[in-house]
């Protein structure tokens, strides 16, 4: 049986949210790696 439209809307909102959180975490990790690299180069 099909889900009601409201629940469909939210499931796709949640998927988008998950993707955005993953992207933000990836960027944060990249920034952290860059800082570590700069510390090593700076020494």
């Amino acid at each position: 049986s099909e889900e009601p439209p409201i629940s469909l809307d939210l499931t796709f909102h949640l998927l988008r949210e998950v993707l955005e959180m993953a992207r933000a975490e990836q960027l944060a990790q990249q920034a952290h790696s860059n800082r570590k690299l700069m510390e090593i180069i700076g020494k």
């Epitope: 889900e3 009601p4 409201i6 629940s7 809307d9 939210l10 499931t11 796709f12 909102h13 949640l14 998927l15 949210e17 998950v18 955005e20 959180m21």
Partner: antibody, heavy 115, light 112 residues
Framework: EVQLVESGGGLVQPGGSLRLSCAAS????????MSWVRQAPGKGLEWVAN????????YYVDSVKGRFTISRDNAKNSLYLQMNSLRAEDTAVYYC??????WGWGQGTLVTVSS | DIVMTHSPLSLPVTPGDPASISCRSS???????????LDWYLQKPGQSPQLLIY???NRASGVPDRFSGSGSGTDFTLKFIRVEAEDVGVYYC?????????FGQGTKLEIK
Amino acid sequence: EVQLVESGGGLVQPGGSLRLSCAASGFTFSDNWMSWVRQAPGKGLEWVANIKQDSSENYYVDSVKGRFTISRDNAKNSLYLQMNSLRAEDTAVYYCSRGLALWGWGQGTLVTVSS
Amino acid sequence: DIVMTHSPLSLPVTPGDPASISCRSSQSLLHSTGYNYLDWYLQKPGQSPQLLIYLGSNRASGVPDRFSGSGSGTDFTLKFIRVEAEDVGVYYCMQALQTPYTFGQGTKLEIK
């Protein structure tokens, strides 16, 4: 660091009103759905309501529909829950949370409905 | 509304041992996108809840890899490779397939 700080709880008589607030920081508030979840003393968690980034959509559990209103002010990084016609069964700690998946939670504010 | 049911409701464990918690939903949480709309939360004593697992099997940021989520449709499991003393608290599953989102009644994990 993500921070959510609830306020506005307290003791109120049945039939009374309260407005809860949640001050958000450490993330882009206007990019996120926001939610309220409550927990009656010694009981489990109950999802109450959520609201879209631009306030164009909101959803409620049946037991609070027509009595509670979720709202937000993106300019102030704040989430609100206006609670009217309060009942004894609304007594709970109310948590605000970031997102649909409830990524982060505040410390909660206690609402006690009693005569 | 979708009803979520935990088992067991209480789980005494010995540190270092594996453990698992089950959660069953009254209807399938498998969406047409292929994702299961099931999250797991932990509420440690005296603290606010925290997200552990989202969409059935994805660990939230900072969650140790000794936790894992599995299952599909109506039957889900939260597994601990080895329980540590800091894992005590109440574990809740929540369905996010449709509003109102609903939580299970919780499983209390305690150390023997």
